[in-house]
């Protein structure tokens, strides 16, 4: 299953398959989900360690068992692979890093204002894969405002180092966000030239595609199908790149297919994974287990459930067959591909789905009334779980917030249906930025079913939480994905980084706003809370948060909306945005309907019809 | 230049059987899958089988599951479809076609063979 | 199997216009989806492939777009000789099933 807990100072013993620099733990554990042998990864900061040649130092491992012996080291960081962590599996990176200037191929050079500005040209420069900025106080007044777009052969810095004034940071094109745009289009019978990064064996175009996009120097391939004159180079996908970018010639060839990256594309980038079966091929590998199960279905499933394998072959030979049962044959290789790809054969064959991040349907746990005021904008993707709830009835408008929990499950308040409990006139907007986007040819989600708490009443402040489910479940992509929730009764975690988003008003008296508004708000313990609200009763089962100056806050428009914290890399709905004094006054923090204190009544109300919970459980 | 050529079309009461043979040209046969599509008169395109370029892989829509029977012949360089306990239903054009696996489409198809079962 | 949705079933336009045929499934299938052609009297014929991609030979005025559960079919500026039926095709698993058909009749 999915595991996210980190160890602090620790550090894995053996079962080393690679090793490179990365900037944090997060992003060493991202290199480690998407290598297709790592399973356990070790990061070491650069307080950690004295060798300067192993500061920032991340070890990507593989264990048979899945596990592997930890030894004590201080500040090293240690965990998990996200394979089979669903909706949490994603290439995208959006950190900046302060004070550390990441190493590699400076290729270009531009003077800029910010770091953002930095990035943005990183993201739309097709060889760039991070950056450094020099900022305006850099002790060299000739590098001041120098923005440094960088590349290596394997996609992460060659070395990094500690230096003031530097800010460092990776493309933003595994998230969807490059200004470049993509060549969708296929070229059959077609061969392009330059110089091959890689070489791997995929039984069609679309797998060779997919494999170009998610390599970290792939800009175009050429695949040669089963039926190329050479038996040799039969299924051969070639990844490629070239210093322009692009082919620098392309020859016509019988039976060669040839294609773009996908990487530059705009909103959408495909899945990490290969979910197609295909018929009458067998895929050669290392065997990792046999299994007789019924039907290929199935054996996909027991590939992707076992962590380590990668691809499968489910024979119908009558001699690996008894009654409705046949052998399925687990298998792995070095780069995740086959080793050999044979056709016309009694078997089908596919890959574990292990890298999907679609995941089940679900609403994602762990184990362990009222446009935000004082925020800014928030750009595509930051906070994909949040909807906008909207109420057509003569016109249409924009009422409440939500977050999105599951393929078909939004959390919101309950006091947003005050009054207007008919599911048929809502209408619910996902990944979205700007209200003004939405045209009448936007797609929606319409509600199937409004659960709103058995104990909230109207105009009372307490249980103000409910649940939508959605006719239809929803695809998730970079910019549509849930929030994970808390683990029931968390009051052990202290959250130091948390944050309220919406479209509310800008302040008590305004409007709704355009673009998704942000704002960092420190948490309050209920003490302090309930001192500020002396009239109402503030329970456990509501969280707090606000300045004690205010001048920023959730405000009519957020409710209902998320406020969410980031610990150990990873988001949590912490509190649903519920009710408060005005907006943003002084010493009246806005208070939020606590999660975790609900966890019992959301895992009952989204237990599927079969009687199982809709959980998944990245810890 | 593909050739794909259907004969063996005709008419045929219910309940009796009749053979389809697709013979090519213009490629090597061996090393492709091939499909057998058929058309209703006046209505849309319905995916009957599909095999695999050994005969060793093959595949049916559930409404001709357990009456027909896909199979081919790389030495001659021919496809067929045995139809068996044919119904009024099975009335089309029956088209064969190559199936390019590595972009997953029909990319070559043949005229087609009618098939009219009637008493 | 996977069952495909193809909308409308019927357009009438004028040479010079633009149409747009949609294909829905209910599963997600990635952009393994095709567009044949079929004109009167003769089997049908791939225009395009992987949801985007033109076969060879086929007039550039013929695009596809989407992935995963929507798609379409644009022709930018309709000729006379593209009256034909449209289907769609999803060759993500087998059977290997097709939309119902657009029948494209021209003004």
């Known amino acids: 299953g999915c595991l996210t807990q980190l160890y602090e100072n620790a550090f894995f013993r053996g079962g080393d398959v690679a090793s490179m620099y990365t900037p944090n733990a997060q992003y060493c554990q991202m290199r480690c989900t998407f290598h297709p042998r790592c399973l356990l990864f070790s990061f070491l900061p650069a307080s950690s360690i004295n060798d300067m040649e192993k500061r920032f130092g991340c070890f990507l491992k593989d264990s048979v068992t899945g596990t592997l012996p930890k030894v004590h080291r201080t500040g090293a960081v240690s965990g998990h692979s996200l394979k089979q962590c669903g909706h949490q599996i994603s290439a995208c990176h959006r950190d900046i890093y302060k004070g550390v200037d990441m190493r590699g191929v400076n290729f270009n050079v531009s003077k800029v204002s910010s770091v953002e500005e930095c990035q943005k040209r990183c993201t739309s420069n097709i060889r760039c894969q991070f950056f450094s900025y020099a900022t305006q106080t850099f002790h060299k007044a000739e590098y001041r405002n120098n923005c440094l777009l960088k590349y290596s052969p394997g996609g992460t810095p060659t070395a990094i180092k500690v230096l003031s004034n530097v800010e460092s940071g990776f493309s933003l094109k595994p998230c969807a966000l490059s200004e470049i745009g993509c060549h969708m289009n296929i070229f059959q019978h077609l061969a392009f030239s330059d110089v091959d990064v890689a070489r791997v064996l995929t039984p069609d175009a679309f797998v060779c595609r997919t494999i170009c996009t998610y390599h970290p120097n792939c800009l175009f391939f050429t695949f040669y199908t089963n039926v190329w004159k050479i038996e040799s180079q039969r299924n051969v996908c070639l990844l490629k790149t070239s210093e322009s970018g692009t082919p620098s010639s392309s020859t016509p060839q019988e039976n060669t297919i040839s294609g773009y990256s996908l990487l530059t594309c705009k909103r959408t980038l495909p899945e990490p994974c290969h979910s197609k079966i295909y018929p009458g091929v067998d895929f050669g590998g290392e065997e990792l287990n046999v299994t007789f199960v019924k039907g290929v279905n199935v054996c996909q499933e027991t590939c992707t459930k076992m962590i380590r394998c990668q691809f499968f072959t489910y024979s119908l030979l009558p001699e690996d067959c008894k009654e409705e049962k046949c052998k399925c044959f687990l298998r792995l290789s070095m780069d995740g591909s086959p080793t050999r790809i044979a056709y016309g054969t009694q078997g089908s064959s596919g890959y574990s789905l292990r890298l999907c991040n679609t995941g089940d349907n679900s609403v994602c746990t762990t184990k362990t009334s009222t446009r935000i005021v004082g925020g800014t904008n928030s750009s595509w993707g930051e906070w994909p779980w949040q909807v906008s709830l909207q109420v057509k009835l003569t016109a249409q408008r924009h009422l409440c917030g939500g977050s999105l929990i599951g393929h078909q499950w939004v959390l919101t308040a309950a006091h947003c249906f005050d009054g207007l409990p008919l599911q048929d006139v809502w209408r619910i907007y996902s990944g979205i930025l700007n209200l003004s986007d939405i045209t009448k040819d936007t797609p929606f989600s319409q509600i199937k079913e409004i659960i709103i708490h058995q104990n909230y009443k109207v105009s009372e402040g307490n249980h103000d939480i409910a649940l939508i489910k959605l006719q239809a479940p929803l695809n998730y992509t970079e910019f549509q994905k849930p929030i994970c929730l808390p683990s029931k009764g968390d009051t052990s975690t202290i959250y130091t980084n948390c944050w309220v988003t919406g479209w509310g008003f800008s302040k008590e008296k305004g409007e709704i706003q355009n673009i998704l508004q942000k704002v960092n708000i420190p948490l309050v313990t209920n003490e302090e809370c309930q001192k500020r609200y002396q009239d109402y009763k503030i329970t456990q089962r509501m969280v707090c948060a606000g300045y004690k100056e205010g001048g920023k806050d959730a405000c009519k428009g957020d409710s209902g909306g998320p406020l969410v914290c980031k610990h150990n890399g990873m988001w949590r709905l912490v509190g649903i945005t519920s009710w408060g004094e005005g907006c943003a006054r002084r010493e009246q923090p806005g208070v939020y309907t606590k999660v975790a204190e609900y966890m019992d009544w959301i895992l009952e109300k989204t237990q599927s019809s079969d009687g199982k919970a809709q959980m998944q459980s990245p810890a | 230049e593909v050739q794909l050529l259907e004969s063996g079309g005709g008419l045929v009461q219910p309940g009796g059987s009749l053979r389809l043979s697709c013979a090519a040209s213009?490629?090597?046969?061996?090393?492709?899958?091939m499909a057998w599509v058929r058309q209703a008169p006046g209505k849309g395109l319905e995916w009957v089988s599909y095999i695999v370029s050994s005969g060793g892989f093959t595949s049916y829509a559930d409404s001709v599951k357990g009456r027909f029977t896909i199979s081919r012949d790389n030495s001659k360089n021919t496809l067929y479809l045995q139809m068996n306990s044919l119904r009024a239903e099975d009335t089309a054009v029956y088209y064969c076609?190559?199936?390019?696996?590595?972009?997953?489409?029909?990319?070559?198809w043949g005229q087609g063979t009618l098939v009219t079962v009637s008493s | 199997d996977i069952q495909m949705t193809q909308s409308p079933s019927s357009v009438s336009a004028s040479v010079g216009d633009r149409i747009t045929i949609t294909c829905r499934t209910r599963?997600?299938?990635?952009?393994?989806l095709n567009w044949y052609q079929q004109k009167p009297g003769e089997p049908p014929k791939l225009l395009i492939f992987?949801?985007?991609s033109l076969q060879s030979g086929v007039p550039s005025r013929f695009s596809g777009s989407g992935t995963g559960t929507e798609f379409t079919l644009t022709i930018s500026s309709l000729q006379p000789e593209d009256l034909a039926i449209y289907y769609c095709?999803?060759?993500?698993?087998?059977?290997?099933?097709f939309g119902q058909g657009t029948k494209l009749e021209i003004k």
């Open positions: 095709q999803q060759s993500y698993d087998i059977p290997f099933t």
């Open positions: 076609t190559t199936w390019a696996g590595w972009i997953a489409a029909a990319d070559y």
């Open positions: 213009g490629f090597t046969f061996s090393e492709y899958d």
């Open positions: 599963q997600s299938i990635s952009n393994y």
């Open positions: 992987a949801a985007s």
